[in-house]
């Protein structure tokens, strides 16, 4: 058993049918010695008397808010949560496996640049009685500071019969140098509590591996005289690290017909312009990627050919 | 400690091309190592990230773009001094700080070259003959060093009398390639910045 926060405790259980569970001793936070009784949640049934209460915690029915009283007055509370270990593996019931980029990916994180700011998000089908708390650091043995905000519900989607809820959090490394070569990964730890179930999820990454630039901005077309060709131009996104000559991007320019089946023409360039043939009803899209370290491509920025 | 903006004219910078080749070569070699050594811990998540140049060179600090010198987090490291004459400095206006930067890059390349050659000698003794260093990558390191053209003492190739542990050598190769790829990215960024300045 360990303390998650004041008066909230996590009991780690080896979770299998007929498991013996864990013996837990609760102590009433009071100078009083006599006349103390214990109850669980809203029930008025007295579970025991005395300054300490010993309980065998086996299932969720044994978890909850234990309260010690004296003469009708509440003295203190202890909330017991359960953390299930199933055959040596901690349970992952609360969050959805996003399966990208690999199985057992519960937290996904992205950064728009090298400033040390990043966003993580996760999915769940649970809509109520759910709380998250997020901590982060650079490295784990001698951790350096990363400050995270509060996790917020960022999207709701309908997936088949189920509703899916997306939560996200923004974090910022306290003293980040955009040019630094990372040797210690960023660690992100999310505590999730659903009713009386506790779970924790972690992700470890280098900022360089989660970079996903914003799409190029100011995408414009300039028709070339007496030609079906157009000059496409764009600019670096505002959120990208500067100077751009140091933090350079490379670009992919795509001409896509109305029909998805039509052949796509693609051009790769390090410049912020390209000359392409603009077909009728086609659209031109441009996306960006770090020129030197191949992390994710940005989303496409698009303009119609007409 | 930082790169001045007034540096050689665009196109006058012979090292840019070599640094791009270097990044391509090390990335290809790393990809090959990850595929060939699939049953070894060779991915970025599995290896320890060690930098063999730590406390010996200070490339990131010495080559910091002028715009980042206002960022205190980028300025908290040691000073290191280097030999300062090189042929990539294709302009008389080049400052001492830029010379220090290019000299630091040269020292990096020299250190990695020695490590890779020593490692290759060990890998050639492996009866499994599972993986060797790409000669193209070694050649590209050499070409960039020649383009930088710094006078520096030659570092003798490390020779080892004990029987090599091939498992450990292959893991060390992965660690070295990951670190060298990261340094090659920094070198490419620096060369691109200097070329544009």
């Amino acid at each position: 058993i360990w303390e998650l926060k004041k008066d909230v405790y996590v009991v780690e259980l080896d979770w299998y049918p007929d498991a013996p569970g864990e013996m837990v001793v609760l102590t009433c936070d009071t100078p009083e010695e006599d006349g103390i009784t214990w109850t669980l949640d809203q029930s008025s049934e007295v579970l025991g008397s005395g300054k300490t209460l010993t309980i065998q915690v086996k299932e969720f029915g044994d978890a909850g808010q234990y309260t010690c009283h004296k003469g009708g007055e509440v003295l203190s509370h202890s909330l017991l949560l359960l953390h299930k270990k199933e055959d040596g593996i901690w349970s992952t019931d609360i969050l959805k496996d996003q399966k990208e980029p690999k199985n057992k990916t519960f937290l996904r994180c992205e950064a728009k640049n090298y400033s040390g700011r990043f966003t993580c998000w996760w999915l769940t089908t649970i809509s109520t009685d759910l709380t998250f708390s997020v901590k982060s650091s650079r490295g784990s043995s001698d951790p350096q500071g990363v400050t995270c905000g509060a996790a917020t519900l960022s999207a709701e989607r309908v997936r088949g019969d189920n509703k899916e809820y997306e939560y996200s959090v923004e974090c910022q490394e306290d003293s980040a140098c955009p040019a630094a070569e990372e040797s210690l990964p960023i660690e992100v730890m999310v505590d999730a509590v659903h009713k009386l179930k506790y779970e924790n999820y972690t992700s470890s990454f280098f900022i360089r591996d989660i970079i996903k630039p914003d799409p190029p901005k100011n995408l414009q077309l300039k028709p070339l005289k007496n030609s079906r060709q157009v000059e496409v131009s764009w600019e670096y996104p505002d959120t990208w690290s500067t100077p751009h000559s140091y933090f350079s991007l490379t670009f992919c320019v795509q001409v896509q017909g109305k029909s998805k089946r039509e052949k796509k023409d693609r051009v790769f360039t390090d410049k912020t312009s390209a000359t392409v043939i603009c077909r009728k009803n086609a659209s031109i899209s441009v996306r960006a990627q770090d020129r030197y370290y191949s992390s994710s491509w940005s989303e496409w920025a698009s303009v119609p050919c007409s | 400690r930082n790169l001045p903006v007034a540096t050689p004219d665009p196109g006058m910078f012979p090292c840019l091309h070599h640094s791009q080749n270097l990044l391509r070569a090390v990335s290809n070699m790393l990809q090959k190592a990850r595929q060939t050594l699939e049953f070894y811990p060779c991915t970025s998540e599995e290896i320890d990230h060690e930098d063999i140049t730590k406390d010996k060179t200070s490339t990131v600090e010495a080559c910091l773009p002028l715009e980042l010198t206002k960022n205190e987090s980028c300025l908290n490291s040691r000073e290191t001094s280097f030999i300062t004459n090189g042929s990539c400095l294709a302009s008389r206006k080049t400052s001492f700080m830029m010379a220090l930067c290019l000299s630091s890059i040269y020292e990096d390349l020299k250190m990695y070259q020695v490590e890779f050659k020593t490692m290759n000698a060990k890998l050639l003794m492996d009866p499994k003959r599972q993986i060797f260093l790409d000669q193209n990558m070694l050649a590209v390191i050499d070409e960039l060093m020649q383009a930088l053209n710094f006078n520096s003492e030659t570092v003798p190739q490390k020779s080892s009398l004990e029987e090599p542990d091939f498992y450990k050598t292959k893991i060390k190769l992965c660690i070295l390639l990951h670190a060298f790829r990261i340094r090659a990215v920094t070198i490419d960024r620096v060369m691109s910045y200097l070329n544009a300045s």
């Epitope: 299998y16 040596g88 | 811990p41």
Partner: antibody, heavy 115, light 111 residues
Framework: QVQLVQSGGGVVQPGRSLRLSCAAS????????MHWVRQAPGKGLEWVAF????????YYADSVKGRFTISRDNSKNTLYLQMKSLRAEDTAVYYC????????WGQGTMVTVSS | SYVLTQPPSVSGTPGQRVTISCSGG????????VKWYQQLPGTAPKLLIY???QRPSGVPDRFSGSKSGTSASLAITGVQAEDEADYYC????????????FGTGTKVTVL
Amino acid sequence: QVQLVQSGGGVVQPGRSLRLSCAASGFTFSSYGMHWVRQAPGKGLEWVAFIRYDGSNKYYADSVKGRFTISRDNSKNTLYLQMKSLRAEDTAVYYCATHGSQDNWGQGTMVTVSS
Amino acid sequence: SYVLTQPPSVSGTPGQRVTISCSGGRSNIGSNTVKWYQQLPGTAPKLLIYGNDQRPSGVPDRFSGSKSGTSASLAITGVQAEDEADYYCQSYDRGFTGSRVFGTGTKVTVL
């Protein structure tokens, strides 16, 4: 006392279907994940499928993916394995088992796929 | 399916120490716990060891398990006639409850 009682095995022709059941008692069935494991005659144990305690996630071995469906009815304390497009190589004793460090197994039920 | 490799058979005389190896990889034994089962002819497997080296109550202490790196082993110290059976190791792949992997099985013969 944890008990898993299996039923539904038998002889079936290739291409046909069969549904196995596993009735659980002596524990809170709705709190635990469940597995199906099989053993071909004279061969070793092969994991077949797993279902989470609430039925929200199901996982299958490649050899049965798309043909077998694991399901559960927590109100009836019963685990099921629906087997379709059966092949000769599916002939085996099928066991249901609880998920956890100390697991419990059913007695097994024989499925023979033969023409 | 992922398979853990065991020797097909091992044998020993009563009272001898018998060990069965179980070899896997980084994604299964290397990163998860190991179980061992005993299966007597015509019966369901019986759990002998869980969590690499833990014995459920009722399992004689002559059975012990251990794990090192990507391999595990089961030792029977002072093997007895009633230990003649098939033995299987089991783990998970990539910390994934939905991917139980079994060993190929070892027949223990008591001479």
